[in-house]
């Protein structure tokens, strides 16, 4: 082009208000009306209106003249209810009376299917300590548990763990006061992500890998009932709950003497082709760098702000996007791919088999996931899960975003980092962290409480305008985040990943190690070594910092060689030395398994705490292989090898 | 398909209390609205209130001290009572079904004959 | 309280379009229906869901919602269309009908 051709430079600020201007114009609530119509609810995956509305978001991509738009075809099982309803009854220990409880309407996927009689007691939300802190042994007996705190498969696994041999979920009153005690609710019980049938390696139609299982699959039967069912099961149970439970006041501990509960599961395993939608917007410097934005498509119910929000987010973004490239002059330097999962309601299934499916090179290109799920369920509070590579980025943003409702800053705690909540199972930015190392985020506008109708089958929209009348406003806002984030991440020639903020991580982690130096003395190990690593990875950020500095910004080969520095340092907390198949989240910060930090140390608790469990062999390799999964980190950070001190 | 037929006292006196009831046929009574709603003399549609197959009851706030739904699912029924009526409850009362679509919202897709009920001294 | 206001008469030409509006605030953030009353009868359902025709409701009978207002549009009128209509949305677990529109076909 000729320099009279040339685009004019648009920075930070042209850029923000930009995006600000062109969602002022954006009817998010028309969006998200448009997805709560007939033709596109229920849209359970796999079903033929999830299809439809793939079909609509693809079409809706390519109306908006995205660089490209594609689909993935994945083959993956899952659970369904079976046309033989489950069901839960009271019997007499003899059998001398039988009484149906309810044939609920939900139904938990991936349960055992298996039929199982005992005495009933509530482990409140059937978290660890929940089950430490009962009375009643819950051993060869079923457990009841609340909705809400942990998920579903946690609750389960904790249930396993204490030898119970069934588990009912329901919703109380108090935590989801929902006037209808009769509305049925789903969820799954799989302690993990993606087709547990295909763990660790990708459901394409054409891999012929043998039958496998995820390890995270429980072994006991689990079913949703009604609140109804629960107050029918608590008029036949004794022992108040107690009130530090701020529960239900019908809520009872354990069956009577004379009668026992029987749960019946018989839910089908179904193979369904999901699809997962993807568009491009191509970076105009470094294409092969992209951000992914993505949001959930499916829900078993209506799924109104379950998983109709974060599609409308992702249309207006995909729409405002675009134009902001084709008719407004924006360059950004990286890619933007927006992607729509399916099977999001069975462990964000698809979007884990699209990481699964590009392991060994999706860490190489993608350096941020940005999830729109669930990001509009109240108006009260903004809250964010996030890797603290994204902590500066996001700080940034919240300083820059009104609160829709207030006016205000989103940003009025300069203690939110500390504050930020670990991304749980049930959240499509686990698997980007924990499993492929790719920094991720998500956040919603909410309430102090849950949105009560997740996974139920009043998730509608008319219960979503009517909680939220502001929605247009808040989904704005939502939207306004996003796209900050995103243009932050595609825009500078600097990416916008604080590396330095993994300091902090180490630095507490050591610290909460060094309260047992008394222990790891007595065993004659040293810490000595974890401080090096520890060390090593603060000086090489601080190198990183000093070659950024002095790099000439305008050298395009420098920047991306630093820049790429930068991109591996989340996927370098992956363990190295375990297998993705046998420990998909390898992440030793934010991962699960006994490579993790956290596991390291609550093992240590028990040398002082129950020593019979503590096993030395491996602790020893705990501490050995998180040194160096941190040493290895630090290397990868300071660049070639001829620049690594290796004192090690 | 389905069908409402309604029946009930046409001519009261000021604080009697009204009473219809609406059959069902042809049709499942779970998983419905079933509601009342009335139409004064040359004058628009006015909803009552409706009874939800969960077993609750909503009422129109005006209404809400004088009107009582309830079901006979057995014989797949439902009544309408007012009580304390007075000259200006005269008008056209329906029965109808309430179908929710997938919005949460819904509309009424089947309509009972409707019943003239005048209240006179 | 929550109302929606409709003009209580339209008049048209048979083989014109008739627009009858029904508006309220933020109506476009719910959803609308419409129902068709001729005298003497029970009302029909012929637009649910902002613009959804049940089974056996013609083609000329359209809806839309946006902003304040949702609007049906009969296209072709016939003199068969002569009727009350009426809208209706949700608020806060209450129904509300609109007062009514008298279309007359002349």
């Known amino acids: 082009k000729d320099d009279d051709d040339k685009v004019p430079q648009l920075y930070w600020d042209d850029l923000k208000k930009m995006l600000s201007e062109k969602l002022d114009t954006t009817d998010f609530t028309s969006t998200i009306k448009l997805l709560n119509e007939n033709s596109y609810v229920p849209r359970e995956a796999g079903s033929q209106k999830d299809e439809n509305l793939a079909w609509y978001i693809e079409n809706q991509f390519r109306e908006c003249k995205l660089s490209k738009v594609w689909r993935d075809e994945h083959f993956v099982k899952i659970q369904v209810k079976d046309s033989a309803q489950n069901s839960v009854t009271i019997t007499g220990t003899n059998s001398e009376f039988v009484y149906l409880v309810e044939n609920p309407g939900g139904y938990v996927a991936y349960s055992q299917n298996a039929t199982v009689t005992g005495k009933l007691v509530h482990a409140n939300f059937g978290t660890e300590k929940d089950f430490e802190d009962l009375d009643s042994p819950v051993n060869g007996s079923l457990v009841i548990v609340r909705a809400g705190k942990i998920t579903f498969a946690e609750k389960v696994a904790n249930a396993e763990s204490a030898n119970a041999i069934g588990v009912l979920i329901y919703m109380d009153k108090t935590k989801f006061p929902i006037v209808d005690a009769d509305v049925s609710f789903f969820g799954h019980a799989h302690l993990g992500t993606g087709d547990p049938y295909t763990p660790g390696f990708p459901s394409f139609n054409h891999t012929q890998f043998p039958p496998s299982r995820s390890s995270g699959l429980p072994n006991i039967p689990v079913q949703t009932i009604s609140r109804a069912a629960a107050e029918r099961l608590f008029e036949n149970m004794e022992g108040d709950c107690p009130s530090d439970w701020k529960t239900d006041s019908s809520c009872r501990m354990v069956t009577s003497q004379n009668k026992s509960v029987k749960l019946s599961v018989s839910n089908v395993m179904k193979e369904i082709k999901i699809l997962n939608i993807f568009g491009v917007i191509k970076g105009f410097v470094e294409p092969d760098r992209y951000v992914v934005v993505g949001a959930q498509r499916d829900s078993w119910g209506p799924g109104a702000a379950k998983s109709s929000v974060g599609t409308a987010l992702l249309l207006e973004l995909a729409q405002t996007f675009s134009d902001m490239v084709l008719k407004d002059g924006f360059q950004p330097s990286r890619s933007i791919v927006f992607a729509s999962w399916s099977a999001g309601d069975f462990g964000s299934v698809g979007a884990t088999e699209w990481l699964e499916g590009y392991l060994s090179s999706l860490h190489l290109k993608a350096f941020t996931f940005i999830n729109l799920d669930k990001a509009v369920l109240g108006t009260s509070n903004f809250r964010v899960s996030a890797s603290p590579l994204l902590y500066a980025l996001i700080e940034k943003t919240m300083q820059e975003v009104k609160h829709p409702v207030t006016g205000l800053s989103l940003y009025q705690d300069s203690n939110w980092a500390s504050k930020v909540e670990k991304l749980t199972f049930d959240n499509a930015a686990f698997p980007f962290l924990a499993y492929s190392g790719i920094p991720a985020v998500s956040f919603c506008f909410c309430e102090d409480t849950d949105y009560p109708y997740l996974g139920t089958t009043m998730d509608t929209y008319k219960e979503l305008i009517e909680k939220i009348p502001q929605l247009n406003k808040v989904a704005r806002a939502a939207a306004e985040v996003a796209g900050q984030f995103m243009i932050k991440l595609t825009h500078d020639v600097e990416l916008n990943l604080d590396y330095e903020r993994y300091n902090s991580q180490l630095l507490s982690f050591l610290r909460n190690l060094n309260q047992y130096r008394a222990d790891i003395r007595e065993m004659g190990l040293s810490l000595q070594w974890l401080y090096s690593a520890r060390g090593d990875f603060f000086r090489a950020t601080s190198r990183l910092t000093t070659d950024f500095k002095n790099s000439e910004k305008t050298d395009r080969f420098v920047m991306k060689e630093l820049n790429d520095r930068v991109m591996k340092v989340e996927y370098y907390f992956l363990s190295p030395y375990v297998s993705p198949r046998e420990s998909p989240f390898r992440h030793i910060f934010w991962g699960s398994g006994s490579h993790t930090l956290s596991a390291l140390l609550e093992h240590l608790k028990l040398r002082k705490t129950n020593n019979r469990a503590f096993n030395e062999t491996l602790f020893r390799n705990q501490l050995a292989l998180a040194t160096w999964t941190i040493q290895g980190a630090a290397n990868a950070l300071s660049g070639d090898i001829w620049d690594i001190d290796n004192e090690f | 398909q389905v069908q409402l037929q309604q029946w009930g006292a046409g001519l009261l006196k000021p604080s009697e209390t009204l009473s219809l009831t609406c059959a069902v046929y042809?049709?499942?009574?779970?998983?419905?609205?079933w509601t009342w709603i009335r139409q004064p003399p040359g004058k628009g549609l006015e909803w009552i209130g409706e009874?939800?197959?969960?077993?609750?009851?909503n009422y129109n706030p005006s209404l809400k001290s004088r009107v009582t739904i309830s079901v006979d699912t057995s014989k797949n029924q439902f009544s309408l009572k007012l009580s304390s009526v007075t000259a200006a409850d005269t008008a056209v009362y329906f029965c109808?079904?309430?179908?929710?679509?997938?919005?949460?919202?819904?509309?009424?897709?089947?309509w009972g004959q409707g019943t003239l009920v005048t209240v006179s001294s | 309280s929550y109302e929606v206001t409709q003009p209580p008469s339209v008049s048209v030409s048979p083989g014109q379009t008739a627009s009858i509006t029904c508006s309220g605030h933020?109506?476009?953030?719910?959803?609308a229906c419409w129902y068709q009353q001729k005298p003497g009868q029970s009302p029909v359902l012929v637009i649910y869901?902002?613009?959804k025709r049940p089974s056996g409701i013609p083609e000329r009978f359209s809806g839309s919602n946006s902003g304040n207002t949702a609007t049906l549009t009969i296209s072709g009128t016939q003199a068969m269309d002569e009727a009350d209509y009426y809208c209706?949305?949700?608020?806060?677990?209450?129904?509300?009908f609109g007062g009514g529109t008298k279309l007359t076909v002349l």
């Open positions: 042809g049709g499942s009574f779970s998983g419905y609205y």
């Open positions: 869901q902002d613009r």
């Open positions: 933020k109506l476009g953030d719910k959803f």
């Open positions: 209706q949305t949700w608020y806060s677990s209450t129904v509300i």
């Open positions: 109808a079904r309430g179908s929710m679509d997938s919005s949460g919202f819904y509309s009424f897709d089947f």
């Open positions: 009874f939800i197959h969960s077993g609750s009851t």
